[in-house]
Amino acid sequence: HNTTVFQGVAGQSLQVSCPYDSMKHWGRRKAWCRQLGEKGPCQRVVSTHNLWLLSFLRRWNGSTAITDDTLGGTLTITLRNLQPHDAGLYQCQSLHGSEADTLRKVLVEVLADPLDHRDAGDLWFPGESESFEDAHVEHSISRSLLEGEIPFPPTS
């Protein structure tokens, strides 16, 4: 799998899309996980509704949402109020029981907000009770990693 880079601005929302073959993955729930290290496990962040029919319903875990267009074959993940610690390697997955197929590898890059001169201590973090259904999603910039590019910095 090639890795696709999605860039977002700190404090704004980033939308990640993962296209897939809707017939191949018919009936399968999807998930978004974060890769822990270059060869480490992929830790589940959020998954689609337990009922595949309701996969279009947005599900949240903290500031991360997932929704699946099962007929069109597009999984969409929204990272709300993007922070530097959100940067890293992720995967979109199709779930088969305890197994998972990788639909796309994603490298999230967080760019500093050029208009934001506040201290990090002033950054707003969403409260649990706040709804993001009407959150404004900024256009995300994406590209594929070139051959030879490494998504993780080399370890000494």
């Epitope: 073959d21 017939m23 191949k24 018919w26 595949w52 029919l53 099962t70 088969h96 305890s98």
Partner: antibody, heavy 122, light 108 residues
């Protein structure tokens, strides 16, 4: 009519190679998984593996991994099951079957081939 | 892998009687991915039930499926002569998509 038509019965000797086929018609062959199932004489059904002809993604049962190869040629809507070196214990009926898509995301092998009898004997 | 265990191995009943077949999974299976098949001697299997409880096209309503998690049941409300056959359950949840060992429904 949606159907899967399998190749004819085979009689082989131990150590020989074999490739049996399963041709789909009446539907979009590339958008349904095709599975292979073994039934030894007088025994139950055993799931061998499955292939998605659209991109040839293949899954095997651990019991059959390395023993058989599942492939597909989407240009002629045909899936294959092959052995490089047959054993007497490969004697069985082999079925191909389509994994159907149902509303609500349900799955089930809804169309079956007629079966191919493979006899391996010296 | 998920092991599917069917019971009883053989069920001896008379036409008109009710048949209850059990299928137990070694770990939880989503009901969306549980199917039942019928096989008669010399024939390919035929899909009866998908999604644990949905009848496939052309299957009479005397066949019904139920259950969730690890325990599933196929019920034939009134056995007809053509129902005497072998029945298999299968899970499509997690590869390998295993079958149960089968239950033979025979005439008493």
């Amino acid at each position: 009519e949606v159907q899967l038509v399998q190749s004819g019965a085979e009689v082989k000797k131990p150590g020989e190679s074999l490739k049996i086929s399963c041709k789909g018609s009446g539907y979009s062959f590339t958008t349904y998984w095709i599975g292979w199932v073994r039934q030894m004489p007088g025994k139950g059904l055993e799931w061998m593996g499955i292939i998605y002809p659209g991109d040839s993604d293949t899954r095997y049962s651990p019991s059959f991994q390395g023993q058989v190869t599942i492939s597909a040629d989407k240009s002629i809507s045909t899936a294959y099951l092959q052995w490089s070196s047959l054993k007497a214990s490969d004697t069985a009926m082999y079925y191909c079957a389509r994994a159907g898509h149902y509303d609500g995301g349900h799955l089930g092998m809804d169309v079956w081939g007629q079966g191919t009898t493979v006899t391996v004997s010296s | 892998e998920i092991v599917m265990t069917q019971s009883p191995g053989t069920l001896s009943l008379s036409p008109g009687e009710r048949a209850t077949l059990s299928c137990r999974a070694s770990q939880s299976v989503s009901s969306s991915y549980l199917a039942w098949y019928q096989q008669k001697p010399g024939q390919a299997p035929r899909l009866l039930i998908y999604g644990a409880s949905n009848r496939a096209t052309g299957i009479p309503d005397r066949f019904s499926g139920s259950g969730s998690g690890t325990d599933f049941t196929l019920t034939i409300s009134r056995l007809e002569p053509e129902d005497f056959a072998v029945y298999y359950c299968q899970q499509d949840d997690s590869a390998p998509y295993t079958f149960g060992g089968g239950t033979k429904v025979e005439i008493k």
